[in-house]
């Protein structure tokens, strides 16, 4: 049966919900899928269900709620129906489904090189997604940076931080690294998508000036 796969709010001002609509092997045709929602802003379940306001903007098998339909103070319940029957249902508040857009504008600077010339430390910086209103406290983002050598498969994860820059220590000189960052709303469990990968190439020692310059 069709099921909700994800509801997501990128910035606490809009949200969208998505569902599966696979071909049902050996089952009768369910008919068109519709999404209905109610704002559960009382303790009773007597409120009317309204149909999805926008089936188009968030892509196929989705419903988009623009800012006119979104409030942080009110819990929502949504249900998928087919032929008049409910096939899936879930309830949430907007703050529970925050998944920020990826951080942007990643860049790096060299901090220092070890005396042996084998390792280097870098500072990675980025910006919050454009639609996350950080200044006003409207969103409080926590960031996770991951990095790896280009030819490796496993990413190394750094502890989550609240700032938009972090030092990465002891990278091997003459290797190329991939760095990526993602964010989540503080105290909420949902990380957003990763940023575009930042490539970090640390030139060999001969390309640096004297080591003393870094100390």
């Amino acid at each position: 049966e069709p099921k909700f796969t994800k509801c997501r709010s990128p910035e606490r001002e809009t949200f969208s919900c998505h569902w599966t609509d696979e071909v049902h092997h050996g089952t009768k045709n369910l008919g068109p899928i519709q999404l209905f929602y109610t704002r559960r802003n009382t303790q009773e379940w007597t409120q009317e269900w309204k149909e999805c306001p926008d089936y188009v903007s968030a892509g196929e098998n989705s419903c988009y709620f623009n800012s006119s339909f979104t409030s942080i103070w009110i819990p929502y319940c949504i249900k998928l129906t087919s032929n008049g029957g409910t096939v899936d249902e879930k309830c949430f508040s907007v703050d529970e489904i925050v998944q920020p857009d990826p951080p942007i504008a990643l860049n790096w600077t060299l901090l220092n090189v070890s005396l042996t010339g084998i390792h280097a430390d870098i500072q990675v910086r980025w910006e919050a997604p454009r639609n996350a209103d950080i200044q006003k406290g409207w969103m409080v983002l926590e960031y996770e940076l991951q990095y790896k050598e280009v030819n490796e498969t496993k990413w190394k994860m750094m502890d989550p931080i609240l700032t938009t820059s972090v030092p990465v220590y002891s990278l091997k000189v003459d290797k190329e690294y991939e760095v990526r960052v993602r964010s989540k709303q503080r105290n909420s469990g949902n990380y957003g998508e990763f940023s575009e990968v930042l490539y970090v190439t640390l030139p060999q020692m001969s390309q640096f000036t004297c080591e003393e310059d870094f100390y």
């Epitope: 704002r39 009382t42 409120q47 103070w73 105290n187």
Partner: antibody, heavy 127, light 107 residues
Framework: EVQLVESGGGLVQPGGSLRLSCAAS????????IHWVRQAPGKGLEWVAY????????SYADSVKGRFTISADTSKNTAYLQMNSLRAEDTAVYYC????????????????????WGQGTLVTVSS | DIQMTQSPSSLSASVGDRVTITCRAS??????VAWYQQKPGKAPKLLIY???SLYSGVPSRFSGSRSGTDFTLTISSLQPEDFATYYC?????????FGQGTKVEIK
């Protein structure tokens, strides 16, 4: 018993600063948003700011943005309103009030609206 | 910001009268409207939330209703303790706003 108790009000000169406190008890402070609402003498209610201490969210009325800062200390179950660059028009009784956070309606018989209020603290801005 | 236009600003009524106070939102706020009662020198008290839900412990003579962006607080039979100022409030927007208030006085 749910209680909100404000303190920190008083007389301050224009341009001065004051910090109000709102001590909460009898409910899970982290799972609510705390709002400051003020009332100028003989006037109506004006919403000032809120904080959701669990998520760290804050928001401010345009009239105080950039001058007032709301914060919370969950270990003390206390919310604060730091008021800087005070003006004569900030003279008012300041109330703190609770609004349950909708994320927790499953467990708390969620209802909306500011259900508990403090007794208020008077802030007078005058030279 | 969403404006809440409350009317009348004051009214005179007698004990036993039916009293109606209205509030109009400048844009859609769903049913995210509450009504409060305030007496002089006291903090406001929640009466109605979600436009029409009676808050626990509030007498049943108080009721709320919604028609689009128009919201109404009704006191079916005014009692002596009901003489006070009443405020509507929208909490649809993250920037919460109140109506200007309606003072209910004894005729």
């Amino acid at each position: 018993e749910v209680q909100l108790v404000e303190s920190g009000g008083g007389l301050v000169q224009p341009g001065g600063s004051l910090r109000l406190s709102c001590a909460a008890s009898g409910f899970n402070f982290s799972y609510s948003s705390i709002h400051w609402v003020r009332q100028a003498p003989g006037k109506g209610l004006e919403w000032v700011a809120y904080i959701s201490s669990y998520y760290g969210y804050t928001s401010y009325a345009d009239s105080v943005k950039g001058r007032f800062t709301i914060s919370a200390d969950t270990s003390k179950n206390t919310a604060y309103l730091q008021m800087n660059s005070l003006r004569a028009e900030d003279t008012a009784v300041y109330y703190c009030a609770r609004l349950q956070h909708p994320s927790w309606y499953y467990y708390q018989g969620y209802h909306s609206g500011m259900d508990y209020w403090g007794q208020g603290t008077l802030v007078t801005v005058s030279s | 910001d969403i404006q809440m236009t409350q009317s009348p600003s004051s009214l005179s009524a007698s004990v036993g009268d039916r009293v109606t106070i209205t509030c109009r939102a400048s844009q859609s706020v769903s049913s995210a409207v509450a009504w409060y009662q305030q007496k002089p020198g006291k903090a406001p008290k929640l009466l109605i939330y979600s436009a029409s839900s009676l808050y626990s412990g509030v007498p049943s003579r108080f009721s709320g209703s919604r028609s689009g962006t128009d919201f109404t607080l009704t006191i079916s039979s005014l009692q002596p303790e009901d003489f006070a100022t009443y405020y509507c409030q929208q909490y649809w927007s993250s920037l919460i706003t109140f109506g200007q208030g309606t003072k209910v006085e004894i005729k």
